[in-house]
């Protein structure tokens, strides 16, 4: 029987910069029941606080609700693991909420086949940013990525759309049914999950284009 091994806080995420959650990995348990506590202070403070919510984020987590989350202050936190034989501490972790945002997927993905008379046909798609993200403040830049594939294909084809919320793709296989998804990330944050798949049937008379794709 031994003191617990060193835990590691390995992940922190915020869906919208208004709340966030951090998760830790326990070290070895030393063969005894182990209690974990997360303590933190914010930049400019000396007073240490204990995690306000160990429940919401699931096992080995700490959730900071709205009243505990500040975008203006860096959080300095560590996890203490304790059993009957002793304690061990994680390394200190510094968290700036700006840099841990992982948004919800984009919304309202619509996909259409456009067949203008004077030009080659193309696949046109548009979407909306996730509702929890406030883009009006200006500091939040969302980047988008699209992926699509024929229904029975194994490999996805991905396209980076930058900050745009619409996109054209010119090169598709006629007669195929395609799955299309979109995801987003803040410039220094994390990719969202992919949006639910939208299906689109490419007409059999769709003419392949040499130019692969272009932004709208």
């Amino acid at each position: 029987q031994l003191p617990p091994g060193k835990p590691e806080i390995f992940k922190c995420r915020s869906p919208n910069k208004e709340t966030f959650t951090c998760w830790w990995r326990p070290g070895t348990d030393g063969g005894l029941p182990t209690n974990y506590s997360l303590t933190y202070h914010r930049e400019g403070e000396t007073l240490m606080h204990e995690c306000p919510d160990y429940i919401t984020g699931g096992p080995n987590s700490c959730h900071f609700g709205k009243q505990y989350t500040s975008m203006w202050r860096t959080y300095v936190m560590m996890v203490n693991a304790t059993n009957q034989m002793g304690s061990s501490f994680s390394d200190e972790l510094y968290v700036d909420v700006t840099y841990i945002v992982q948004p919800d997927p984009p919304l309202e993905l619509t996909v259409e086949v456009k067949q203008p008379e004077d030009r080659k046909p193309y696949l046109w798609m548009k979407w909306s940013p996730p509702t929890l993200i406030d883009l009006k403040t200006g500091w939040f830049t969302l980047l988008y990525e699209i992926r699509l594939k024929p229904e029975k294909a194994a490999e996805w084809e991905t396209h980076f759309a930058g900050q745009q919320t619409e996109f054209k793709i010119l090169s598709l296989h006629p007669g195929q049914k395609y799955l299309v998804q979109v995801r987003c990330k803040p410039d220094h944050g994390y990719w969202s999950a992919w949006s639910p798949a939208t299906f689109i049937q490419i007409p059999s008379d769709f003419i392949m284009n040499d130019h692969h794709h272009h932004h709208h």
Epitope: E8, F10, K11, C12, R25, E43, G44, M71, W72, T74, D91, L93, Y94, V95, D96, T98, Y99, I100, T137, G138, W139, K185, H188, Y190, W191
Partner: antibody, heavy 118, light 112 residues
């Protein structure tokens, strides 16, 4: 203990490429961005770019765009910086550095001297 | 790119005496999220740089309290209240508000 251990010194010819490695240990490699910073002899520090090892998303200093490629290998917890079309002005010590969930550099590698000479 | 200008270029200080380094940026370092990402690093002779101060005035873990940072907007200062022999090296200010991140030219601190 967090460690960033870089590959050894290199001597390269003008026009060639160099690839410097940075092996991370003591933490979960995919959790934090890795940055590359260089320092020419007797000069200051210059930020080259950064990578998020979780998905290999990169941002580069436009000054190096097209010449620098930053990659990460999750299986070996190693980041790489490749600089191509080398010229004598690229002679420098190249550092990798790690952030937290922040945008400043908390841990630094020991540096790799790259000498470009004909 | 944001240009960071440090003064003085070098500083020779008697142990126990204070020292002050100034850093000026060519544009405001207030991020649109309200934070100011101005940091100070020390590069001791023959070593890699090490973080001293983050976000203007916050000492990094293990940094002695004789180091303090202040300033806002475009003008920032690093102060050492009582210089010790181990403080010798080159001090750099750095901004990470705007990409590309940039560094000042450095201030060399020597002991008299």
């Amino acid at each position: 203990e967090v460690q960033l251990v870089q590959s050894g010194a290199e001597v390269k010819k003008p026009g060639s490429s160099v690839k410097v490695s940075c092996k991370a240990s003591g933490y979960t490699f995919t959790s934090y961005w890795i940055h590359w910073v260089r320092q020419a002899p007797g000069q200051g520090l210059e930020w080259m770019g950064e990578i998020d090892p979780s998905d290999s998303y990169t941002n580069y200093n436009q000054k190096f765009k097209g010449r620098v490629t930053i990659t990460a290998d999750k299986s070996t917890s190693t980041a790489y910086m490749e600089l191509s079309s080398l010229r004598s002005e690229d002679t420098a010590v190249y550092y990798c550095a790690r952030s937290f969930f922040t945008n400043w550099f908390a841990y630094w590698g020991q540096g790799t001297l790259v000498t470009v000479s004909s | 790119d944001v240009v960071m200008t440090q003064t003085p270029l070098s500083l020779s200080v008697t142990p126990g005496q204070p020292a002050s380094i100034s850093c000026r940026s060519s544009q405001s370092l207030v991020h649109s999220n309200g934070n100011t990402y101005l940091h100070w690093y020390l590069q001791k002779p023959g070593q890699s740089p090490q973080l001293l101060i983050y976000k203007v005035s916050n000492r990094f873990s293990g940094v002695p309290d004789r180091f303090s940072g202040s300033g806002s907007g475009t003008d920032f200062t690093l102060k050492i209240s009582r210089v010790e022999a181990e403080d010798v090296g080159v001090y750099y200010c750095s901004q990470s508000t705007h990409v590309p991140f940039t560094f000042g030219g450095g201030t060399k601190v020597e002991i008299k």
